[in-house]
Amino acid sequence: MMTGTIETTGNISAKKGGSVILQCHLSSTMAQVTQVNWEQHDHSLLAIRNAELGWHIYPAFKDRVAPGPGLGLTLQSLTMNDTGEYFCTYHTYPDGTYRGRIFLEVLESSVAEHSARFQI
């Protein structure tokens, strides 16, 4: 069992063509975060936020991914193919690795709700 806890935006939905914020928050630990990785459902890396080197957005996502707010990630110009799981991986010392999961559903409907409630 890990010392800390990852809180995420949980299951969220957003409109096709719109944007969404993916957020994770690490709490209940004194460990220092050296890097946060953001991965897509197929385990491809979207972006990295390194404590020393700053943000790196992977080339395939440069047009549609924006860093922040904070350690979070903003996905823009959403397509139906963006539906799926997203993972934040916190690399910390001395605790090791923490991993959070978010499920994003992209909806065609104009009544798509963007739920951004935090849940553990």
């Epitope: 069992m1 890990m2 010392t3 004194m30 220092q32 050296t34 890097q35 990785n37 990295i48 390194n50 404590a51 020393e52 080197l53 991986t89 690399h91 010392y93 001395p94 605790d95 090791g96 690795t97």
Partner: antibody, heavy 122, light 107 residues
Framework: QLQLQESGPGLVKPAETLSLTCTVS??????????WTWIRQPPGKGLEWIGT???????FHNPSLKSRVTIPVDTSKNQFSLKLSSVTAADTAVYYC??????????????WGQGTLVTVSS | DIQMTQSPSSLSASVGDRVTITCRAS??????LNWYQQKPGKAPKLLIY???SLQSGVPSRFSGSGSGTDFTLTISSLQPEDFATYYC?????????FGGGTKVEIK
């Protein structure tokens, strides 16, 4: 098979800077999942953690060594180093480099170099 | 800093004996306790991590237990190659600290 190899002078004069290098083979020092560590052992005594570094340069060190420690990383050479300034005879020890293992919470030191003895003497 | 205290500091035992080494932390470290074996002139070798998990390749005669502040390393049947010094180490928080070691000698 991952291997770590320490190198550097075996004799350092008091008040000078001790410099050691750890070369990692069989794996990448740039791995996001690993941290890299220096540990020392004075002759006939126990183990002391010196400090730990991430590939990007984030460093954690033992407060007992105050600001004497720096741990640079050279990812192009797959190496990390130890620089300990203002050394005294009390810094005489076998110095080990080690990897902080992945995949478990609060990971241990799972791979170690063979160690190198550094003597501080004039 | 978290102090790690090992006992005994040394012990004499015979091949086939059951050997128990204890390690006590000055505050709770949950199960973040690791055990290492060191032979003269060699680097320490990881035996047990997370208090009770056996590192790959380590014989099953080695086992670990405990949580909180009190931990135990047990060698169920001492073999000739087990005569060495054993160290506990906490990976709960920095600074990382080790116990003073327990030297297991031949009786």
């Amino acid at each position: 098979q991952l291997q770590l190899q320490e190198s550097g002078p075996g004799l350092v004069k008091p008040a000078e800077t001790l410099s050691l290098t750890c070369t990692v083979s069989g794996g990448s020092i740039s791995s996001y999942d690993h941290y890299w560590t220096w540990i020392r052992q004075p002759p006939g005594k126990g183990l002391e953690w010196i400090g730990t570094v991430y590939y990007s340069g984030s460093t954690f060190h033992n407060p007992s060594l105050k600001s004497r420690v720096t741990i640079p990383v050279d990812t192009s050479k797959n190496q990390f180093s130890l620089k300990l300034s203002s050394v005294t005879a009390a810094d005489t020890a076998v110095y080990y480099c080690a990897r902080v293992g992945p995949d478990v919470s609060h990971p241990p030191f799972d791979y170690w170099g063979q160690g190198t003895l550094v003597t501080v003497s004039s | 800093d978290i102090q790690m205290t090992q006992s005994p500091s040394s012990l004499s035992a015979s091949v086939g004996d059951r050997v128990t080494i204890t390690c006590r932390a000055s505050q709770s470290i949950s199960s973040y306790l690791n055990w290492y074996q060191q032979k003269p002139g060699k680097a320490p070798k990881l035996l047990i991590y997370a208090a009770s998990s056996l590192q790959s390749g380590v014989p099953s005669r080695f086992s670990g237990s405990g949580s909180g502040t009190d931990f135990t390393l047990t060698i169920s049947s001492l073999q000739p190659e087990d005569f060495a010094t054993y160290y506990c180490q906490q990976s709960y928080s920095t600074p990382i600290t080790f116990g003073g070691g327990t030297k297991v000698e031949i009786k």
